[in-house]
């Protein structure tokens, strides 16, 4: 058992039949040493006396708010949670693995450059009784501050019969050296609670394996005199880090006819601009990427032909 | 064209070599599936190598500052992992692939460190780490964490290098 | 009706052991809280061990100590064992549905005594 914050426990369990469960001692927060009496949640059953309790834990009618009384007032609660292990493996019945880019991935996180700000997210299918706490550092044994903000519910989607949410935070390192090369991973943590279940998720990467620049901004098309030729141009977009000349992006540019089976043509450039031929009913799009870093390709940005 | 002595490096020839290693460094170790080589416990194999850290004056402010700091680092960092590349980590067991572009990286290394050290000119180098692990499977993996390693490492040079080329060039 | 029928009881040795039962009957065995309880001579109603339905149990203090409480819920039946018994654990036990003993037995008398 550890505390997960005031008054707030985490009862670590092997989960399989007739498991023996865990014995927790509960002690009442007060001076008080004669006549307390305990109940749990709404209940106004005693289930027993004394300034300490022993219970055994091994399912969740067992965990829930444990609250001591002295002739009818309250002198102290203590609210257990559980955290179900299975077959040696920790429960993750909270989130949903997003399988990319690998199985069992339930957070993913971005960055949109090398201030050390970056974006974390998860999704679930359950709607109430869920708290999410989030925690982060860079590097474990001798960790470096990393704020994080609070989980806050960033999207809702049907998907089939199931309504699926999607939770995001933001982090910032608070020492952030964007120039460097990393040699710690950023760690984030992230404490999951639905109802009476303790979960809780990490992952760890180096912020320069989660840039995605945002798409290039400004894109316009310049026709070539006398040519089928244009000329497009964009512009870095405006959350990249600077200066340009040392973080630099390198772009994709393609054309794409209204149908998704003609073929696509694609020119590869450091350059802000490019010429390429403008087909009718076509679209130039335009992606960013790290110059010199294999980060993600930044969204598509695009403009039609005509 | 050399900087040991103060004087500036070939700016231009750097950023065109450190691109191209950059290119090389990721044709060697594409990302397979995003392989999490941190998930395999590689503290004791790869925490020896010499990372561009915040005070080794790489950014643009260091740079214009004095950029000496920054490219006796990476004359360090590249001397490192062209000793690595030569080592029998890659040179043994199970051998590379006769197009593998590991050759052609290594030669690189070595050609963007002459150019920022010619002969004559000595800084310190750091030493190198006894990796020898006995089995091919080990050094396989050991090749993929090194790789992996060094991408992060040429990408803040080619930065370095490119950022140079466009502001300190003469 | 409730009806709760201790046994199991007598005259124990020092250092010896018990296991008392309690027969339920009148009521949902098999959903209830129950509890065990003793009344020394001269002294007031102590509570020794509640057991939930699906057998989780609560001891005073900071152990479970000497006394160990588990039901059959097929045979509406509640146990206590007592082990490495004392002079001082003579009593009049009783299983009861609640704390306050205000539904219980008539109780099984524990005497130890060398």
């Known amino acids: 058992i550890w505390e997960l914050k005031k008054d707030v426990y985490v009862v670590e369990l092997d989960w399989y039949p007739d498991a023996p469960g865990e014995m927790v001692v509960l002690t009442c927060d007060t001076p008080e040493e004669d006549g307390i009496t305990w109940t749990l949640d709404q209940s106004s059953e005693v289930l027993g006396s004394g300034k300490t309790l022993t219970i055994q834990v091994k399912e969740f009618g067992d965990a829930g708010q444990y609250t001591c009384h002295k002739g009818g007032e309250v002198l102290s609660h203590s609210l257990l949670l559980l955290h179900k292990k299975e077959d040696g493996i920790w429960s993750t019945d909270i989130l949903k693995d997003q399988k990319e880019p690998k199985n069992k991935t339930f957070l993913r996180c971005e960055a949109k450059n090398y201030s050390g700000r970056f974006t974390c997210w998860w999704l679930t299918t359950i709607s109430t009784d869920l708290t999410f706490s989030v925690k982060s550092s860079r590097g474990s044994s001798d960790p470096q501050g990393v704020t994080c903000g609070a989980a806050t519910l960033s999207a809702e989607r049907v998907r089939g019969d199931n309504k699926e949410y999607e939770y995001s935070v933001e982090c910032q390192e608070d020492s952030a050296c964007p120039a460097a090369e990393e040699s710690l991973p950023i760690e984030v943590m992230v404490d999951a609670v639905h109802k009476l279940k303790y979960e809780n998720y990490t992952s760890s990467f180096f912020i320069r394996d989660i840039i995605k620049p945002d798409p290039p901004k400004n894109l316009q098309l310049k026709p070539l005199k006398n040519s089928r030729q244009v000329e497009v141009s964009w512009e870095y977009p405006d959350t990249w880090s600077t200066p340009h000349s040392y973080f630099s992006l390198t772009f994709c540019v393609q054309v794409q006819g209204k149908s998704k089976r003609e073929k696509k043509d694609r020119v590869f450039t450091d350059k802000t601009s490019a010429t390429v031929i403008c087909r009718k009913n076509a679209s130039i799009s335009v992606r960013a990427q790290d110059r010199y870093y294999s980060s993600s390709w930044s969204e598509w940005a695009s403009v039609p032909c005509s | 064209r050399a900087v040991p002595g103060g004087s500036s490096p070939a700016w231009t020839q750097c950023q065109q070599l450190s691109q191209k290693l950059c290119t090389l460094a990721w044709s060697a170790h594409p990302l397979v599936g995003h392989m999490d080589l941190r998930e395999e416990g590689d503290e004791e194999t790869t925490n020896d190598v010499p990372h561009i850290q915040c005070g080794d004056g790489c950014d643009p402010q260091g740079l214009r500052d004095n950029s000496q700091f920054c490219l006796q680092r990476i004359h360090q960092g590249l001397i490192f992992y062209e000793k690595l590349l030569g080592s029998d980590i890659f040179t043994g067991e199970p051998s590379l692939l006769p197009d593998s572009p590991v050759g052609q990286l290594h030669a690189s290394l070595l050609g963007l460190s002459q150019l920022l050290q010619p002969e004559g000119h000595h800084w310190e180098t750091q030493q190198i780490p006894s990796l020898s692990p006995s089995q091919p499977w080990q050094r396989l993996l050991l090749r993929f964490k090194i790789l992996r390693s060094l991408q992060a490492f040429v990408a803040v040079a080619a930065r370095v290098f490119a950022h140079g080329a466009a502001t300190l060039s003469p | 009706e409730v009806q709760l029928v201790e046994s199991g009881g007598g005259l124990v040795q020092p250092g010896g052991s018990l296991r008392l039962s309690c027969a339920a009957s009148g009521f949902t065995f098999s959903s209830s809280v129950m509890f065990w309880l003793r009344q020394a001579p001269g002294k007031g109603l102590e509570w020794l061990s509640t057991?939930?339905?699906?057998?989780?149990?609560i001891y005073p203090g900071s152990g479970k100590g000497r006394f160990t409480i588990s039901r059959d819920n097929a045979k509406n039946t509640l146990y206590l064992q007592i082990n490495n018994l004392k002079p001082e654990d003579t009593a009049l036990y009783y299983c009861a549905r609640d704390i306050g003993g205000t539904v219980r037995g008539q109780g099984t008398q524990v005497t130890v005594s060398s």
């Open positions: 057991i939930k339905p699906t057998g989780s149990t």
